[in-house]
Interface confidence: medium
């Protein structure tokens, strides 16, 4: 949530509000057909985990959904910092990353939004 | 320490437009969001938006879109607050606060006056 | 937008009194409120954040409690330095908001 936004911890800043609180810093927010969208929120204790998925509508049309997270099925062990990967049929769900850090999920893939609108195609 | 300090004070004419600029110091200037309220006399707090200094990405309270610009230098680590075509009610001491809300300009008063 | 309905707005009170404002969201915003103490010619200082938790360096004399709409700010023994007027302001969701002020005045 807005608490006048997010913030990270520098070693030479760390006032109380930055100390023994390690919820995640998530964006929350939703666009049709674009990963290009920021809201900052920090999450609830329930929610541990940043995630964006794109939700295919119709062919070359998707909505992404970027949001606090109680679980996520992406994250693996040993490495559970991040994931991501592709949907196949018939699931919606085409893309989804799920993640731990600051504003993780403030980027989605490395490919722009053409090449995936055709790929939702 | 952190620091965010803040342009002086300004007279403006209505009609016109004025940008107030925040240094930040004592941190790292990309990695938390900056936002700008202001207190008109005699009146409350208003939130005006927030920037991100590390995409130049902003959120623009409804009552100032259209009317108010954020943006940022991250050689100099400054944002800047641009508000035009100024009235007589946008007389107000406008401050940049960091985040959280723990760390706040001095404020910069800007005075509409014909 | 989030209103937020802060009381009352203004207190004559007595240095040693208990002071209590109370605000009140027109939503839930769970635990997501700050208190600020503004004084004149001075930028707004945090006192409480997360409705709940004094911030670093703040007198224990502040205190908050509450969540969901109901939120209350205690100063539990009001010193002549507690002048000024107290905002409570909620980040739950844009815009944010605060409430209408609470000036303190001494009796």
């Known amino acids: 949530h807005l608490n006048l936004t997010a913030r990270q911890q520098d070693p030479e800043d760390t006032p109380q509000t930055d100390e023994g609180d390690d919820r995640v810093w998530c964006h929350v927010c939703e666009r049709e057909n674009t990963f290009e969208c920021e809201n900052p929120r920090r999450c609830q204790w329930t929610e541990p985990y940043c995630v964006i998925a794109a939700v295919k509508i119709f062919p070359r049309f998707f909505i992404i959904s970027k949001q606090c997270s109680a679980s996520c099925a992406a994250i693996e062990i040993p490495k559970p910092e991040e994931k991501r990967f592709l949907l196949e049929e018939p699931l919606p769900f085409f893309y989804l990353k799920c993640c731990k850090t600051r504003y993780c999920n403030l980027q989605g893939p490395a490919i722009n939004t053409s090449s995936f609108k055709e790929y939702a195609g | 320490q952190v620091q965010l300090v803040q342009s002086g004070a300004e007279v403006k004419k209505p009609g016109a437009s004025v940008k107030v600029s925040c240094k930040a110091s004592?941190?790292?200037?990309?990695?938390?969001?900056m936002h700008w309220v202001r207190q008109a006399p005699g009146t409350g707090l208003d939130w005006m938006g927030w920037?991100?200094?590390?995409?130049?990405?902003?959120n623009y309270a409804q009552k100032f879109q259209g009317r108010v610009t954020m943006t940022r230098d991250t050689s100099i680590s400054t944002v800047y607050m641009e508000l035009s075509r100024l009235r007589s009610d946008d007389t107000a001491l406008y401050y940049c606060a960091r985040e959280v809300g723990n760390y706040w300009g001095q404020g910069t008063l800007v005075t509409v006056s014909s | 937008d989030i209103q937020m309905t802060q009381s009352p707005t203004s207190l004559s009170t007595s240095v040693g009194d208990r002071v209590t404002i109370t605000c009140q969201a027109s939503?839930?915003?769970?635990?997501?409120l700050n208190w600020y103490q503004l004084k004149p010619g001075k930028a707004p200082k945090l006192l409480i954040y997360?409705?709940?938790n004094l911030e670093r360096g703040v007198t224990s004399r502040f205190s908050g409690s509450g969540s969901g709409t109901d939120f209350t700010f205690t100063i539990s023994s009001l010193q002549p330095e507690d002048i000024a007027t107290y905002y409570c302001?909620?980040?739950?969701?844009?815009?944010?908001?605060f409430g209408q002020g609470t000036r303190l005045e001494i009796k």
């Open positions: 997360d409705a709940s």
């Open positions: 302001q909620q980040y739950d969701s844009l815009p944010i908001t």
């Open positions: 920037i991100s200094p590390n995409s130049g990405g902003t």
């Open positions: 004592g941190y790292t200037f990309t990695g938390y969001y």
């Open positions: 939503q839930d915003i769970y635990n997501y």
